[in-house]
C-alpha cells in the first residue's frame, strides 16, 4: 500500500492504525474503558459507524470505498479520562493517475471481465493490478489473466468465480518508477453486474387453434430460482410491412416456463425469440435464436 497514514492526536495517543487489507481499524486498549466508538467520515461528509462492543479495541468496516480519501476517528472513555484520535487516510499519489472508467460484468454464468482505462496523468510506465475481496471470507483474489494495451493492464478476465460472494470489493492499485500512483476501489453486487444468457431449449408446438412456446431459464452465476426471472417474448409475423409493430409479451418466471397463445390454422410463417432478465433489475439478456413456425402459404 502506498497510502500515507497521518495521525492527528492529543499528547497521550491511542496509537490508531488501519489495515486496508482487512478494513480493520485498531487502537491501544485502555484500562477501565467505559465507552468506545469508531467511525469514518468521507469527502462527502457521510459518516459510517460500525457496531462495536465496549471491551473491543478494534472495529471492522464492511462496505466502504477509500479512493476519495477518508478520516477515521476513535473516541474512548475510561473511568479516568477521555481519548480522541483522528487518522487521515488519503489516496496518495499524483491526482489523476488512478485507473478510471472501471466496470465489471459476469457472463456465461461463470466468467467475468473487468475493464478500466489508464488515468489521464499516469506516466507511460504505469502498471495496474486488480485485487478482489469477497464480503464473507475476506479472501483476496488476484487477477489471473490481464488484458493489456501497449503493455499496460487495462482489464482482467476471471474464469473461476468461486471466491466471489454476493457483494465484493474491487481494488486497482498502480505502480510506476516515476511517481506515486493513486488507487481506485469499488464495491459491486454480483446481481447487478451479471448479464444473463438468453433462455435455452426454446420450442414451439401448435395445434389447430393455439401455439405453445416453452423454454428453460438460463443458467446463471447467482443462485436464482424461477420467481427471480422475467421473460419477454417477441412473436413476429414474417414478411410483414416494414414498421409493423412486433408483439412483445411479458411473462413472469414459473416452474414450467410456457406461453400459450391463440393462432388458428392456416397460420402464416411466424418467428418467436425470448430474452430473460432479473425481475428486480430488468437487465435484459440478448435474444434467443429465432424459432420459426407456420408456413409461407398460411
Amino acid at each position: 500500500e502506498k497510502s500515507d497514514l497521518r495521525t492527528v492526536a492529543p499528547a497521550s495517543s491511542l496509537n490508531v492504525r488501519f489495515d486496508s487489507r482487512t478494513m480493520n481499524l485498531s487502537w491501544d486498549c485502555q484500562e477501565n474503558t467505559t465507552f468506545s466508538k469508531c467511525f469514518l467520515t468521507d469527502k462527502k461528509n457521510r459518516v459510517v459507524e460500525p457496531r462495536l462492543s465496549n471491551n473491543e479495541c478494534s472495529c471492522t468496516f464492511r462496505e466502504i470505498c477509500l479512493h476519495e480519501g477518508v478520516t477515521f476517528e476513535v473516541h474512548v472513555n475510561t473511568s479516568q479520562r477521555g481519548f480522541q484520535q483522528k487518522l487521515l487516510y488519503p489516496n496518495s499519489g499524483r491526482e489523476g493517475t488512478a485507473a478510471q472508467n472501471f466496470s465489471c460484468f459476469i457472463y456465461n454464468a461463470d466468467l467475468m471481465n473487468c475493464t478500466w482505462a489508464r488515468g489521464p496523468t499516469a506516466p507511460r510506465d504505469v502498471q495496474y493490478f486488480l485485487y478482489i475481496r469477497n464480503s464473507k471470507r475476506r479472501r483476496e483474489i488476484r487477477c489471473p489473466y490481464y488484458i493489456q494495451d501497449s503493455g499496460t493492464h487495462v482489464g482482467c478476465h476471471l474464469d473461476n468465480l468461486s471466491g466471489l460472494t454476493s457483494r465484493n470489493y474491487f481494488l486497482v492499485n498502480g505502480t510506476s518508477r516515476e511517481i506515486g500512483i493513486q488507487f481506485f476501489d469499488s464495491l459491486l453486487d454480483t446481481k447487478k453486474i451479471e448479464r444473463f444468457n438468453p433462455p435455452s431449449n426454446v420450442t414451439v408446438r401448435c395445434n389447430t387453434t393455439h401455439c405453445l412456446v416453452r423454454w428453460k431459464q438460463p443458467r446463471t452465476y447467482q443462485k436464482l430460482s424461477y420467481l427471480d426471472f422475467q421473460y419477454q417474448l417477441d412473436v413476429h409475423r414474417k414478411n410483414t410491412q416494414p414498421g409493423t409493430e412486433n408483439l412483445l409479451i411479458n411473462v413472469s418466471g414459473d416452474l414450467e416456463n410456457r406461453y400459450n397463445f391463440p393462432s388458428s390454422e392456416p397460420r402464416a410463417k411466424h418467428s418467436v425469440k425470448i430474452r430473460a432478465a432479473d425481475v428486480r433489475i430488468l437487465n435484459w439478456s440478448s435474444w434467443s435464436e429465432a424459432i420459426e413456425f407456420g408456413s409461407d402459404d398460411g
Partner: antibody, heavy 120, light 111 residues
Framework: QVQLVQSGAEVKKPGASVKVSCKIS????????IHWVRQTPTKGFEWMGG????????VYAQRFQGRVTMTEDTSIDTAYLTLSSLRSDDTAVYYC?????????????WGKGTMVTVSS | QAVLTQPSSVSGAPGQRVTISCTGS?????????VSWYQQLPGTAPKLLIY???KRPSGVPDRFSASKSGTSASLAITGLQADDEADYYC???????????FGGGTKVTVL
C-alpha cells in the same frame, strides 16, 4: 403440472422419531430446492431448513439443529424430513415447499402438509 | 411470538377494499429485505400470493397488491369476494438467521 405429494398423518409417542416424505411430480428434484416449514396453532409458521445452493448443502434452523435431518433421493424425486426426540410441542402440520426465490427465501409452491401428532 | 406483527383479523363487505399491515424492524423488513405474502384458505396449504414486495405469481388476480415502506409492508385486497376469506401471512428474512420469518397471520372475514 408440478405437484408436491406428502406422506400421510402420523401419531408418535414422545421421544420417538418421525419421517415425512415429499414426492415431486412434473419436475426433476435435482433442479429444485426443497425446504420444510411447520405450522402450529401456538407458534404459527416455523422454517426448519432446506437445500441452500450457495453453500451446496442442506441448512437447518438453529432451534432444530441436532434433531432434524433432511435428505433427498433424486432417483425417485423425493425429499424426506426426519425429526427425532419428539416432544408434545412438535405436534404440527409439516409442509415441504419448492423455493421460488432465494433472495429472500420465498416458498413458491407448497405440499398439502402432513399432520404429526405427538402424544403419550 | 412471531417476528413480524400483523393484526389478528380484518373484515369487509363484498366489493370493498381491505388492507393488512405487517410490521417488522430494522433487522428484517427495514434491513431492507423483500417481503412475500401467503394466503391460506381454511384447511388447505399456504399459497404464494406476492413475492419481492409487490410481484404476483401467474394466476394470482390483480385484485391483490402489496407495498413496502421502511420497516413495514401491507397487502391490499380490492373488490373483496367470498372466496378471499382466509388467513394471510407476511414473511421475510432476519439478519444473521437462515431461512424465513413469518407474521402471526391475519384472518380476513367477508361480511
Amino acid at each position: 403440472q408440478v405437484q408436491l405429494v406428502q406422506s400421510g398423518a402420523e401419531v408418535k409417542k414422545p421421544g420417538a422419531s418421525v419421517k415425512v416424505s415429499c414426492k415431486i411430480s412434473g419436475h426433476s428434484l435435482s433442479e429444485l430446492s426443497i425446504h420444510w416449514v411447520r405450522q402450529t396453532p401456538t407458534k404459527g409458521f416455523e422454517w426448519m431448513g432446506g437445500f441452500d445452493p450457495e453453500e451446496n448443502e442442506i441448512v437447518y434452523a438453529q432451534r432444530f439443529q441436532g434433531r432434524v435431518t433432511m435428505t433427498e433421493d433424486t432417483s425417485i424425486d423425493t425429499a424426506y424430513l426426519t425429526l427425532s426426540s419428539l416432544r408434545s410441542d412438535d405436534t404440527a402440520v409439516y409442509y415441504c415447499s419448492i423455493v421460488g426465490s432465494f433472495s429472500p427465501l420465498t416458498m413458491g409452491l407448497w405440499g398439502k402438509g402432513t399432520m404429526v401428532t405427538v402424544s403419550s | 411470538q412471531a417476528v413480524l406483527t400483523q393484526p389478528s383479523s380484518v373484515s369487509g363487505a363484498p366489493g370493498q377494499r381491505v388492507t393488512i399491515s405487517c410490521t417488522g424492524s430494522g433487522s428484517n423488513i427495514g434491513a431492507p429485505y423483500d417481503v412475500s405474502w401467503y394466503q391460506q384458505l381454511p384447511g388447505t396449504a399456504p399459497k404464494l400470493l406476492i413475492y419481492h414486495n409487490n410481484k404476483r405469481p401467474s394466476g394470482v388476480p390483480d385484485r391483490f397488491s402489496a407495498s413496502k415502506s421502511g420497516t413495514s409492508a401491507s397487502l391490499a385486497i380490492t373488490g373483496l369476494q367470498a372466496d378471499d376469506e382466509a388467513d394471510y401471512y407476511c414473511a421475510t428474512v432476519e439478519d444473521g438467521l437462515s431461512g424465513s420469518v413469518f407474521g402471526g397471520g391475519t384472518k380476513v372475514t367477508v361480511l
